[in-house]
């Protein structure tokens, strides 16, 4: 709990704790000590979870609250037992008050009337000091309904109904302390209301449906130290002295309004706040002058808005600031002497906010600083002299590695090992596949060299995280707008389009010839030759069309570590998302669809002419091994692309996905086709199972020759052993159908499924 | 600019009713109170009472407690005092004054209505 | 009820002049909490509505001639004009709002 923390510690002991020990030992940019040992460890292993220095002192001092949370919260302890059952801690346990409503409790001179279906305030003796009536059903609070209670301090009415509230309403409390008027309905409150309440220190208006305030509203609250309003609908500050008549405020919370200007005027006679608490409204102007006046401020929080720009001297005036949030706002830019002014801070807040022109410049002068907020744990490079930066990671890199799991650090090479193994494997030993179709084999060439890319992407991203590796952060920045990033990126979003596009291009050529076989004619060389080209001249564009144009795009491929673009950032350009989503739910999604579609009809239509044959036990035999092999191809499809549509599509609907997703799907989820294309249109398919027999027998025989001289056979397993995705047994194959798969169009409905290759 | 309208003179038999309007423009007539005070020929003020247009809470000098009734249309922003049983005492310049900021005093007037309760 | 009266009834003198003119309360009209006087004068010119001039016993209201001073406080309050102008020709009403609110009798100004 970090909004006003400091306020509350200055207001109960007067003083400042400094930040513990250790501060003699120097150590260079980038290092703070070990307590008072001489160990200086870098930024990154401080406030990470490990006790890397040995005696707990890199972890110490580590949350956000410079030291005065348990102050704080003694400080708030009553505010926080306001909603328990029994709100006071009498001194004496017997009742003190005169005349009590049969239906409530009493402690001394405090009485509980909560949850007692009360309608009006109840008539009680005049000696009370303290009266809960919450989760009552009080609708108004009329002239003189509390006149008698003269010595009354702490009065609870959350949680009622209250929408009218006389002027003279409160009239009489004159000692009157905590007035808390949370989850009401009030819409206004008179000006003159609080007349009488002198003494008034907390007032809390939470949750309300307060539309407008101005100075008059407040008339009266000479002692107000905390005014909440958070939650209530108020849509703008008064533009005249709002603490006019509240000279000793402190604590001013506004947070969930639906203010969107600040005035000039507004803070001109709030020189005690020291807590101002913006957060979560609709500001999306500031004017220079706005907070000059609050020269007491410690804690500004204007998170969560709609400021665009920052005077460049707006803080000039808050020396004594040492927490600002500014999280969550679309700033396009800060100024490189923005913070210069701030000597005295210790938190800042920018999460959320992309700043284009981040330089070491703007921290520099910050020399307290002791926590910093970032949108992108990569920023914390530009801050080497505070101790806590957060985030770490983004779920795919750290502060130490561009991929934080180590898990994620091995198997980029294993993946990228098998993928480009196996496809360079296969674009080898297809010329000796004889059997063939020369145009087929030129397709599964050509989808096994845009698989290879994934392979050769994963490559160079495990080689960056080599060569990062142990002071990522040092260099995430430039290595994300790096023109290495942008080309692996490109390579990544080539492969994963060329690949896409030829498995459809493909499945469309089987589908055709096994749904329509007598209206499939064998595509030529010169038809095929045209597709492919046309196909990997569509990758081309697709991949590096985000690099054409910087201004629509921004930085497209570096938004994380491993430069792939799959989820759209808050801060991406419209274009960007537009163009993301167009490729991810537009072909992506459209070629999935159509490949599952045709693979279900193919089958649906083998199995329909399979029905006529007469072998029963021999078609069920093959309809099975087919219905693997469709499934095969379908399900490794679905378990590719199923994960990258629902992180779009969640994304698209502003579902907040987490960082980890993103690496984890590049490492794992994005090259399952391109590491098992090779198996499923190649290795398992019978023309290569055949060429395998071919050189195993010649081994083999070879092998015999040389030893005894004798003839030997290959040995039956080869046949015998179900490969996961064979075919049919060898009983029922027939050399002369596993060609191009048009070349079949002449042959029987019974016998076709045995032509799918 | 804030301006008050009032009707310049009414003329009613005693024993009647008569509802007196004020018009109220230029300010947000809900936020503020509308006064009415009366002034009897070459005399004083007497205030009478007060509304707030916001929720139409009321207060009367006790002394026209009987004899007045105030009242607001928010629509057409107009507060009006109904005066009754009228008697000749009743004759005099009738103002309404809009509240200040802070309602402890009246920083707009009418112009009047003088009411004349004659036979 | 707070009873306001107000003295002398009716003065004459001459443009230029300064004047004074007393209201005085039958109850204390300080509020000890806002530390204000709960007091306001106004000025009510022939065949015209009244005026406010000063509110909080001082404190004059804006476009007011600085010529009008409020002063006073608790029960003894006055108005004074530094340097009466022949416009100034009125009837002055001190009102107090401490408990409802009050009108004095008047003070009518009158120029020689």
């Known amino acids: 709990m970090t909004s006003g923390s400091v306020f509350f510690y200055i207001l109960i002991f007067g003083k400042y704790f400094s930040h513990g020990g250790g501060q003699d030992v120097k150590c260079s940019l980038g290092y703070f000590p070990c307590g008072n040992i001489t160990k200086c460890l870098p930024q990154l292993l401080h406030c990470n979870g490990v006790d890397d220095c040995g005696n707990q002192a890199d972890e110490d001092n580590c949350g956000d609250n410079n030291g005065w949370s348990l102050q704080f919260d003694k400080y708030f302890a009553s505010y926080y037992k306001m909603t328990s059952q029994y709100p006071f801690e009498a001194e004496t346990p017997e009742c003190l008050v005169g005349s009590v409503p049969v239906q409530c409790l009493c402690q001394g001179l405090e009485l509980d009337c909560d949850e007692t279906n009360l309608r009006a305030v109840p008539s009680v003796s005049s000696n009370v000091t303290a009266m809960s009536l919450q989760w009552n059903l009080i609708r108004k609070l009329p002239p003189d309904c509390f006149k008698n209670y003269h010595d009354l301090q702490k009065l609870y009415l959350q949680n009622n109904k209250i929408t009218s509230i006389s002027i003279y309403a409160f009239r009489g409390l004159n000692s009157l302390t905590k007035l808390y008027l949370s989850h009401n309905r009030i819409t206004f409150l008179k000006p003159g209301v609080f007349e009488d309440l002198h003494r008034l220190e907390w007032l809390i208006i939470e949750d309300n449906h307060l539309s407008r305030i101005s100075p008059p509203t407040f008339y009266g609250l000479n002692s107000l130290i905390l005014l909440v309003l958070m939650n209530n609908v108020l849509t703008r500050l008064p533009d005249k002295p709002l603490c006019q008549h509240m000279p000793r405020l402190h604590w001013l919370d506004l947070e969930g309004n639906h203010i969107h200007n600040l005035r000039n005027l507004t803070f001109i006679s709030c020189s005690n706040l020291t807590v101002l608490v913006m957060r979560k409204n609709k500001i999306n102007h500031l004017n220079e002058n706005t907070f000059a006046p609050l020269q007491k401020l410690d804690e500004l929080d204007l998170g969560s808005n709609k400021i665009e720009n920052l005077p460049p001297l707006i803080f000039k005036d808050l020396k004594e600031l040492s927490q600002l949030n500014l999280s969550y706002n679309p700033i396009q830019k800060i100024q490189a002497n923005q913070f210069d002014y701030l000597v005295k801070l210790k938190s800042l807040s920018l999460e959320g906010i992309e700043i284009s022109n981040i330089q070491q410049r703007m921290f520099r002068p910050l020399m307290n600083l002791s926590h910093i907020y970032f949108k992108k744990f990569q920023y914390c490079g530009y801050a080497p002299h505070v101790r806590s930066c957060k985030p770490n990671t983004d779920g795919i890199s750290s502060l130490e590695n561009l991929l934080a799991s180590i898990i994620q650090r091995v198997f980029v090479w294993v993946v990228s090992a098998v993928t480009c193994f196996g496809n360079i494997f296969v674009i080898c030993m297809r010329p000796y596949i004889r059997s063939e179709n020369k145009l087929y084999a030129m397709s599964i060439i050509s989808l096994c060299c845009a698989d290879c890319l994934m392979g050769i992407y994963l490559f160079v991203i495990g080689g960056f995280d080599l060569k990062f590796r142990g002071e990522y952060n040092k260099h995430a920045q430039l290595w994300m707008e790096s023109t290495h990033c942008q080309l692996v990126g490109s390579l990544a979003i080539l492969s994963t389009e060329v690949s896409v596009l030829l498995l459809t291009f493909l499945t469309l050529e089987k589908y055709i010839c096994i749904v329509y076989p007598f209206r499939c004619v064998r595509p030529g060389k010169c038809r095929t030759i045209t597709v492919l080209i046309l196909i990997w001249i569509t990758g081309f564009i697709v991949a590096f069309i985000p690099l054409s144009n910087k201004e629509f795009f921004k930085n497209y491929y570096g938004t994380n570590g491993v430069c792939f673009p799959l989820h759209s950032e808050d801060t991406e350009s419209i274009g960007a998302q537009i163009y993301s989503v167009a490729i991810f739910l537009g072909i992506n999604l459209a070629a999935f669809i159509i490949i599952v579609f045709s693979y279900g009809s193919m089958f649906y239509s083998v199995h329909q002419s399979a029905i006529t044959a007469t072998e029963i036990r021999n078609q069920v035999k093959k309809e099975m091994i087919l219905a693997k092999r469709f499934f095969f191809i379908v399900f490794t499809d679905a378990l590719c692309w199923i994960p990258i549509f629902v992180v779009k599509f969640l994304s698209l609907l502003q579902v907040e996905i987490p960082g980890t997703i993103t690496s984890w799907v590049v490492i794992f989820i994005l090259p399952i086709n391109s590491a098992l294309n090779p198996i499923l249109y190649t290795l398992t398919t019978r023309p290569f199972k055949e060429m395998i027999h071919r050189f195993w027998y010649n081994y083999r025989q070879r092998k015999s020759m040389d030893s005894k001289g004798q003839k030997t056979y290959a040995p039956s397993f080869i046949w015998v052993e179900m490969w996961p995705l064979q075919e049919m047994p060898p009983e029922l194959m027939k050399p002369d159908l596993f060609t191009y798969p048009c070349e079949m169009s002449l042959i029987s409905q019974s016998t076709r499924l045995n032509s799918y290759s | 600019q804030v301006q008050l309208q009032q009707p310049g003179a009414e003329l009613v038999r005693p024993g009647a009713s008569v509802k007196l309007s004020c018009k109220a423009s230029?300010?947000?007539?809900?936020?503020?109170?509308v006064n009415w005070v009366k002034q009897r020929p070459e005399e004083g003020l007497e205030w009478i009472g007060r509304?707030?247009?916001?929720?139409?809470?009321?207060h009367y000098n006790q002394k026209f407690k009987d004899k007045a009734i105030l009242t607001v249309d928010k629509s057409s922003s107009t507060a009006y005092m109904q005066l009754s049983s009228l008697t000749s005492g009743d004759s005099a310049v009738y103002y309404c004054?809009?509240?200040?900021?802070?309602?402890?005093?009246?920083?707009?007037w009418g112009h009047g209505t003088t009411l004349t309760v004659s036979s | 009820d707070i009873v306001m009266s107000q003295s002398p009834s009716s003065l004459a003198v001459s443009a230029g002049e300064k004047v004074t003119m007393s209201c005085k309360s039958s109850?204390?009209?300080?509020?000890?909490?806002?530390?204000?006087?709960?007091l306001a004068w106004y000025q009510q010119k022939p065949g015209q509505s009244p005026k406010l001039l000063i509110y909080?016993?001082?404190t004059r209201e804006s476009g007011v001639p600085d010529r009008f001073t409020g002063s006073g406080s608790g029960t003894d309050f006055t108005l004074t004009i530094s340097s009466v102008q022949a416009e100034d020709l009125a009837v002055y009403y001190c009102?107090?709002?401490?408990?409802?609110?009050?009108f004095g009798g008047g003070t009518k100004l009158e120029i020689k």
């Open positions: 509304i707030d247009p916001y929720d139409s809470e009321i």
């Open positions: 009102k107090q709002s401490y408990n409802l609110w009050t």
């Open positions: 909080w016993a001082s």
């Open positions: 004054a809009k509240g200040g900021e802070l309602p402890y005093y009246f920083d707009y």
């Open positions: 109850q204390n009209l300080l509020n000890s909490g806002t530390r204000k006087n709960y």
């Open positions: 230029g300010y947000t007539f809900t936020s503020y109170w």
